[in-house]
């Protein structure tokens, strides 16, 4: 499939101009190669009309230009003084005309409307409102006011001042007569339909002295905005429908065959199953505008999208709409990464998150997608050292392996951890990826005690048993904190006796804490890694208490009877700071991470699409 994309249809009127934008993957080769616009012949060839190398056909001399925008991966063809002869099938493309790196464009140039003299032209977008103004003279002030629509050869009454309304306009039309000072009446038509377009006549009085005014109503179907995004990337649709629909339900739908438009998401709580876990509808502003973010773009997401407002939360005739044509570029710069990661209860997962390697200094985030209301994604951890309180000791975001990938480790898994998670940064908003974590039956491979109590001033030894399948991996112990997990020295104590059917390659690796202090209290992880890639981890909470009797402590698995999440923290263990971060780029250049932390209320950190507050402390 060609990665070139442009408008499928371009419509214009004789004498006017058009501007056609074509998109291409902005590789260095593509940026510098020839760009062209050619007309398709009946026998299949394509005759160049204009190219980026300076060629301009005599047919286009003085009325067309082609401009390349290599930094955007686009080029634009402008054609002026259009005539009906320009109607036809064209291609915009890269390289040589016959190579197939092109996109087919149909250009339709129609005759301008033949209008009667003194005709007022009203050009209004589909779904919007038009006000047709009708002047009259004093002698007709008390007479019947009416509006007719020309259907074929005959005028058909639409509305009059005696209360008649044509059934096609019921509930969406009114006739206003201005105060006595103004000799004007107006007809207001709401929720305009394509079928409303045409010639109208307004009239005051019914005899030969009546006042008449011609009006031509043109209802414009919105031209779709072209959107070119990478496979596996993210797209944001910004929908601004105007304050008049601020309180009406909003929707985003995708056009299927014919005129059908299947709801993708709406503000009434509907969401298409194919978008589960990868869509957020950003709440509306007072002016009725909203935005929808879709991550993890798939080939099948390509197509025409409409956003609109209607009480039903779906497209109806007369809904005000905005349109986009989404092209998903399969020559993606976004690397493949697993869309599903499975973990066992009590065990752990390590998720690789891609980011734009040009933005290595950007802040990395991981959030949990929530489907309630319009969807939201409360932050769980960031690369600046913030971790949501409920995840202390079991969640870490690591900059490794770097060069366009960071790692998130989550351990002590429970069934509640199943769900969709988003990887994102405060840089390139297109690089948002989604991963689903599934919790399956099984046993963790690493064996550690449940929780451990150390005595001040004494020595503590904590074991971690590694099965033989991990023999080729580096084994480590580290102390968890909110910026990561700091490696600690550990001792290899030889083969472990904790595994059945496991040879000499199993290992018991112990963490030793000498002369325990209060600072040693906290979460410790043992784990395996291969270079910069992290594997399984297991967590142990070490509590520190006053000395009762002398000696050192050697913790065995037999003593490990407490559940992994039975952790008792001092009341002053973490002070919740009163800070806020707000980065408008994180959520489609608006309302991004609202991470307000308050000592009274706990905290909230979210890539948000709802207004509910997320309670619970945080650690910095």
């Amino acid at each position: 499939k060609s990665p070139i994309f442009g408008p499928e249809e371009v419509n214009s009127v004789e004498g006017n101009s058009v501007s056609i934008t074509c998109y291409y993957p902005p590789t260095s080769v593509n940026r510098h190669t020839r760009k062209y616009w050619c007309r398709q012949g009946a026998r299949g060839g394509c005759i160049t009309l204009i190219s980026s190398e300076g060629y301009v056909s005599s047919k286009y001399a003085g009325r067309a230009n082609l401009t390349n925008f290599p930094e955007n991966g686009t080029f634009v063809v402008n054609i002026a003084q259009l005539s009906q002869d320009d109607s036809g099938r064209y291609k915009c493309g890269l390289g040589i005309n016959s190579r197939g790196l092109s996109f087919d464009v149909s250009l339709e140039v129609s005759q301008g409307p033949g209008l009667l003299n003194d005709t007022k032209v009203y050009t209004v977008d589909l779904g919007r409102t038009v006000t047709i103004n009708c002047p009259f003279k004093t002698e007709n002030a008390q007479k019947r006011k009416s509006l007719y629509k020309q259907i074929g050869l005959y005028p058909v009454l639409v509305i009059d001042s005696s209360g008649y309304v044509n059934p096609n306009y019921t509930g969406r039309i009114r006739l206003d007569i201005q105060g006595t000072g103004q000799l004007l009446f107006s007809v207001v038509i709401n929720q305009l339909r394509l079928s409303d377009a045409g010639q109208y006549l307004c009239q005051a009085g019914d005899d030969s002295n009546s006042n008449k005014k011609n009006a031509d109503l043109q209802v414009l179907k919105p031209e779709p905005e072209l959107v070119y995004e990478d496979l596996r990337g993210s797209v944001t649709f910004h929908c601004a429908l105007g304050p008049e629909v601020a309180n009406v339900a909003k929707f985003l739908c995708r056009q299927s065959s014919g005129e059908n438009c299947d709801v993708v998401v709406n503000t009434l709580g509907k969401r298409a199953p194919a978008f589960e876990g990868r869509i957020l509808l950003n709440p509306q502003d007072k002016d009725g505008s909203f935005s929808v973010v879709i991550t993890g773009l798939r080939k099948e997401d390509a197509g025409r999208y409409l956003c609109g407002a209607h009480s039903d939360g779906q497209l109806q005739e007369g809904s005000p709409i905005q349109a986009w044509q989404l092209f998903v570029n399969e020559e993606s710069t976004i690397p493949r990464s697993p869309t599903v990661v499975k973990g066992v209860a009590g065990g752990s997962v390590a998720v690789l998150c891609p980011y734009n390697r040009k933005e290595s200094k950007s802040i990395k985030y991981w959030c949990l997608w929530e489907g309630a209301q319009n969807g939201r994604c409360p932050l769980l951890v960031d690369s600046e050292g913030w971790v949501k309180a409920q995840y202390e000791g079991r969640l870490s975001l690591l900059e490794e392996p770097g060069n366009g990938t960071f790692t998130v480790i989550l351990n002590q898994l429970t069934s509640r951890d199943a769900g969709f998670y988003w990887c994102l940064t405060n840089g390139d908003t297109l690089w948002r990826t989604t991963v689903e974590i599934k919790i399956i039956e099984g046993e963790p491979n690493l064996k550690v005690p449940g929780n451990v109590t150390a005595v001040l001033g004494e020595t503590l030894k904590v074991p971690c048993h590694f099965p033989c399948k991990f023999s080729s991996y580096e084994k480590y112990w580290c102390k968890w904190n909110n910026t990561g997990c700091q490696a600690l020295p550990s001792q290899d104590e030889g083969p472990s006796k904790a595994f059945v059917n496991c040879d000499e390659n199993s290992r018991l690796v112990s963490l030793t804490l000498n002369l325990v202090t209060r600072a040693d209290e906290g979460w410790y992880w043992c784990g395996v890694k291969q270079g910069h890639f992290y594997g399984e981890t297991a967590a142990v909470y070490v509590a520190v208490e006053e000395r009762k009797a002398a000696g050192s402590r050697d913790v065995s698995l037999a003593k490990a009877d407490a559940a992994p999440d039975e952790k008792v923290l001092d009341s002053g263990f973490r002070e919740i700071e009163n800070k806020a971060i707000q980065d408008p780029r994180l959520f489609a250049e608006e309302k991004a991470v609202a991470d307000t932390r308050d000592q009274a209320d706990g905290s909230r950190a979210s890539v948000d699409s709802g207004s509910s507050e997320e309670q619970g402390g945080s650690s910095r």
């Epitope: 690397p335 697993p338 599903v340 499975k342 752990s348 395996v528 270079g531 594997g535």
Partner: nanobody
Framework: EVQLVESGGGLVQAGGSLRLSCAAS????????IGWFRQAPGKEREWVSC????????YYADSVKGRFTISSDNAKNTVYLQMNSLKPEDTAVYHC?????????????????WGQGTQVTVSS
């Protein structure tokens, strides 16, 4: 029953090439990872390369990067390790292994299923 069978090993001169195959059967899932490991006499087992079936991503140990290429034929349920520019230090028994769950990036995966191995000897 899950089975992994390696083939393609043999004796080759330094600078030569070999292609190892790992045929997998008995899997009821399609998102597993296959890794290649090697063990030289008297040495620890060493991870060489892996491929994630779910997304096609591939990884290599620094010692083989640029010389070895891992690939997969999903229709045949077979993973290949193309080894070029072989060196005497590549001499080992090469095992393929499968990570059936995929909780971790495949270089650090949990490999529960192992093949018997195929001997690769590189003479100088």
């Amino acid at each position: 029953e899950v089975q992994l069978v390696e083939s393609g090993g043999g004796l080759v001169q330094a600078g030569g090439s070999l292609r190892l195959s790992c045929a997998a059967s008995g899997f009821t899932f399609d998102d597993y990872a296959i890794g290649w490991f090697r063990q030289a006499p008297g040495k620890e087992r060493e991870w060489v390369s892996c491929i994630s079936r779910s997304d096609g991503s591939t990884y290599y140990a620094d010692s083989v990067k640029g010389r070895f290429t891992i690939s997969s034929d999903n229709a045949k349920n077979t993973v290949y390790l193309q080894m070029n520019s072989l060196k005497p230090e590549d001499t080992a028994v090469y095992h393929c292994a499968a990570d059936a769950i995929g909780s971790f990036p495949c270089p650090a995966g949990v490999y529960d299923y192992w093949g018997q191995g195929t001997q690769v000897t590189v003479s100088s």
